[in-house]
């Protein structure tokens, strides 16, 4: 007989689960890339933009070789939860200038939520702890101006793009080691 109803299915193939997470991450990377390009077309960015409330980049050139699956999944999930919060905030407080991108931001949020669910499932199947963010959640106030919300959007999409690119690299490498 199978496991009792309601209990999580133990994966017989962690590689297949990880593969599925990689593909979802790549899909989200494609969406983020496209939306960031749209942002640059509509609201050209003058230089790099940053936002103090965004997670710091998890990677450096030297870290890929020493990655371990629990660390990558935990860090990725925590960072993506932060980005989800920022995308929600952008949709809520972005103002009229970002309203034209509302359908795309909504789709991005939905795919981000889907990836987070997939990561949560993967972590539970691998019996990894569902770590809570180790940093305090910084409340996000309204942008100071219309230009402030545009700069914030550039920063959020740019940071998410780099985070996802790093995640794809890490997950692909880890999959070859499984």
């Amino acid at each position: 007989p199978g496991p009792p109803a309601g209990s999580p299915r133990v994966s017989s193939d962690p590689r297949a689960d990880l593969d599925s997470a990689v593909l979802l991450t790549r899909s989200l990377l494609a969406d983020t890339r496209q939306l960031a390009a749209q942002m640059r077309d509509k609201f050209p960015a003058d230089g790099d933009h940053s936002l103090d409330s965004l997670p710091t980049l998890a990677m450096s050139a030297g870290t890929l070789g020493s990655l371990q699956l629990p660390g990558v999944l935990t860090r990725l999930r925590v960072d993506l939860m932060s980005y989800l919060r920022h995308v929600q905030w952008l949709r809520r407080a972005g103002g009229p200038s970002l309203k034209t991108l509302e359908p795309e931001l909504g789709a991005l949020q939905a795919r981000l939520e889907r990836l987070l669910r997939r990561l949560q499932l993967l972590m539970s199947r691998l019996a990894l702890p569902q770590a809570a963010p180790d940093q305090p959640v910084i409340p996000l106030g309204p942008p100071a101006s219309a230009w402030g919300s545009i700069r914030a959007a550039h920063a959020i999409l740019g940071g998410l793009h780099l985070t996802l690119d790093w995640a794809v690299r890490g997950l692909l490498l880890l999959k070859t080691r499984l």
Partner: antibody, heavy 119, light 111 residues
């Protein structure tokens, strides 16, 4: 015009190293990754690796891990591939190509650098 | 690694004829709404040139006589009416997984 311009042909002895450069122009260098592809005479194209110019963090084809090293100089919009412990089978044309990990195809290619390994 | 097998290895046709080139993958390269197969053209002494990405999307600047189709493991590049400049070698590439790999190529020659 979007362009990738590679360094010139190289002739090396077995056991030596070679470092090829790839200078990007006509686009924002950090908006795309840089991939490297080998084409040996009579062989199929072979992907070597990929690097993100913003963060470094290259990934490699396992076949080239340990011998290929990918680096970038963001300020010069230039990517580099170094191949060490050269052997005769490394005689090939090496291409840099613009890519990204979401869909991972190569839409702009350098003109190629011929590397000949001969004693 | 995923192995891509192209057929035929070579094909001799006349200008104006239709060319059909095949690429078969050793496992499915279609998933999450994408088919991760791309097609390139290469002429002697030149770098490859992207023609089709994600199985059926025509790259900017590529003539409309080129088209791509297929899903799963079987893919096709079609040139509806051959022009002189189309005689070259064609490669498929997958990007479903690490490492991306290429087919061995199909050489299209003038009859």
């Amino acid at each position: 015009e979007v362009q990738l311009v590679q360094s010139g042909a190289e002739v090396k002895k077995p056991g030596a190293s070679v470092k090829i450069s790839c200078k990007a122009s006509g686009y924002t260098f950090t908006d795309y990754n840089m991939d490297w592809v080998k084409q040996a005479p009579g062989q199929r194209l072979e992907w070597i690796g990929d690097i993100n110019p913003t963060i470094g963090a290259p990934i490699y084809n396992q076949k080239f891990t340990g011998r290929a090293t990918l680096t970038v100089d963001k300020s010069a919009s230039t990517a580099y591939m170094e191949l060490s412990s050269l052997r005769s089978e490394d005689t090939a044309v090496y291409y840099c190509a613009r890519g990204e990990l979401a869909h991972w195809y190569f839409d702009v290619w350098g003109q190629g650098t011929t590397v000949t390994v001969s004693s | 690694d995923i192995v891509l097998t192209q057929s035929p290895a070579s094909l001799a046709l006349s200008p104006g004829e239709r060319a059909t080139l095949s690429c078969r993958a050793s496992k499915s390269v279609s998933t999450e709404g994408y088919s991760y197969i791309h097609w390139y053209q290469q002429k002697p002494g030149q770098a490859p040139r992207l023609l089709i990405y994600l199985a059926s999307n025509l790259e900017s600047g590529v003539p409309a006589r080129f088209s791509g189709s297929g899903s799963g493991t079987d893919f096709t590049l079609t040139i509806s009416s051959l022009e002189e400049e189309d005689f070259a070698t064609y490669y498929c590439q997958h990007s479903r997984d690490l490492p991306p790999t290429f087919g061995q190529g199909t050489k299209l020659e003038i009859k």
